[in-house]
């Protein structure tokens, strides 16, 4: 399908790898049914300004991830950040661009928060 990048592998990381019985890091091949889409994801925490990756890997078919070429978290200050995307290794880099809520305009311009990159 034109304009759709298939995900065949994702960067894999698991901070809790021992308990979860997985590898700690690597590349994860994303297999699946022909009618199902596969995505890459990243989850991380912001501990006092320091980025701590929790998990990265393949993500099951999820409409919220469709046609996203970049891995971007848009929620404002979540406890656990999450992003998903489509395309090989698209979760190698991830960023945070919170969507500003549409409110009454103020006299002071709002500066968007800076993104975080891996």
């Amino acid at each position: 399908i034109l304009g759709r990048s298939e995900t065949q592998e994702c960067l894999f990381f698991n901070a809790n790898w021992e308990k979860d019985r997985t590898n700690q890091t690597g590349v994860e091949p994303c297999y699946g049914d022909k009618d199902k889409r596969r995505h890459c994801f990243a989850t991380w925490k912001n501990i006092s300004g320091s980025i701590e990756i929790v998990k990265q890997g393949c993500w099951l078919d999820d409409i919220n991830c469709y046609d996203r070429t970049d891995c971007v978290e848009k929620k404002d200050s979540p406890e656990v950040y999450f992003c998903c995307c489509e395309g090989n290794m698209c979760n190698e880099k991830f960023s945070y661009f919170p969507e500003m809520e549409v409110t009454q305009p103020t006299s002071n311009p709002v500066t968007p928060k800076p993104p975080y990159y891996n």
Partner: antibody, heavy 120, light 107 residues
Framework: QVQLVQSGAEVKKPGASVKVSCKAS????????MHWVRQAPGQGLEWMGF????????SYAQKFQGRVTMTRDTSTSTVYMELSSLRSEDTAVYYC?????????????WGQGTTVTVSS | DIQMTQSPSSVSASVGDRVTITCRAS??????LAWYQQKPGKAPKLLIY???SLQSGVPSRFSGSGSGTDFTLTISSLQPEDFATYYC?????????FGGGTKVEIK
């Protein structure tokens, strides 16, 4: 079709052990983890742990550590859950459930359940 | 361990009603949340995974929303076969934990 078939009901005495089997069919056995969940009469669901069929590694809930053993036989696509030192509180329905290796790891196929009754 | 708190514990509703069940995690679990339906004497059945993704074969009247700590399962128009107990479950960190369940009963 994808199916998990569990062994039949068991009645055990306190202090004994029980071994429940779960035979998988209709999919590649080693491509999915197998988790075990139990449900006491009239109660909710309680996660017990899982086994990775490809390598046999396991992870158990702390509550069952030392009493539960999960094994697998790849030649028959069967996983086993053995619970020892049984007590009356272990009376429950025990379920196996298939879980994708991929996040967010839902339990998408369940066995029919095995009733284990612990009574003196 | 992450605690999952479901509310209400039971709800009485009629066919055609809109039913909403909530689930709260004691700490952030991002979108690592699934919803299951269980009927008496039967195994649980997966309805929703990744907080909002509908499992194959599940009717579209079921929907899930939320992320972080607060999640919702909605049945838009209750059908006779929907009277059952519903459980939320987190898979973000071990041990995996379930909510206490919500029984949907006939009014």
């Amino acid at each position: 079709q994808v199916q998990l078939v569990q062994s039949g009901a068991e009645v055990k005495k306190p202090g004994a052990s029980v071994k429940v089997s779960c035979k998988a069919s209709g999919y590649t056995f080693t491509s999915y983890r197998m988790h075990w969940v139990r449900q006491a009469p009239g109660q909710g669901l309680e996660w017990m742990g899982f086994i990775v069929p490809s390598g046999g590694s396991t992870s158990y809930a702390q509550k069952f550590q030392g009493r539960v053993t999960m094994t697998r036989d790849t030649s028959t696509s069967t996983v086993y859950m053995e619970l020892s030192s049984l007590r009356s509180e272990d009376t429950a329905v025990y379920y196996c459930a298939r879980v994708s290796m991929y996040a967010p790891e839902p339990m998408d196929v369940w066995g029919q359940g095995t009733t284990v009754t612990v009574s003196s | 361990d992450i605690q999952m708190t479901q509310s209400p514990s039971s709800v009485s509703a009629s066919v055609g009603d809109r039913v909403t069940i909530t689930c709260r995690a004691s700490q952030g679990i991002s979108r690592w949340l699934a919803w299951y339906q269980q009927k008496p004497g039967k195994a649980p059945k997966l309805l929703i995974y990744a907080a909002s993704s509908l499992q194959s074969g599940v009717p579209s009247r079921f929907s899930g929303s939320g992320s972080g700590t607060d999640f919702t399962l909605t049945i838009s128009s209750l059908q006779p076969e929907d009277f059952a107990t519903y459980y939320c479950q987190q898979a973000f960190s071990h041990p995996w934990t379930f909510g206490g369940g919500t029984k949907v009963e006939i009014k």
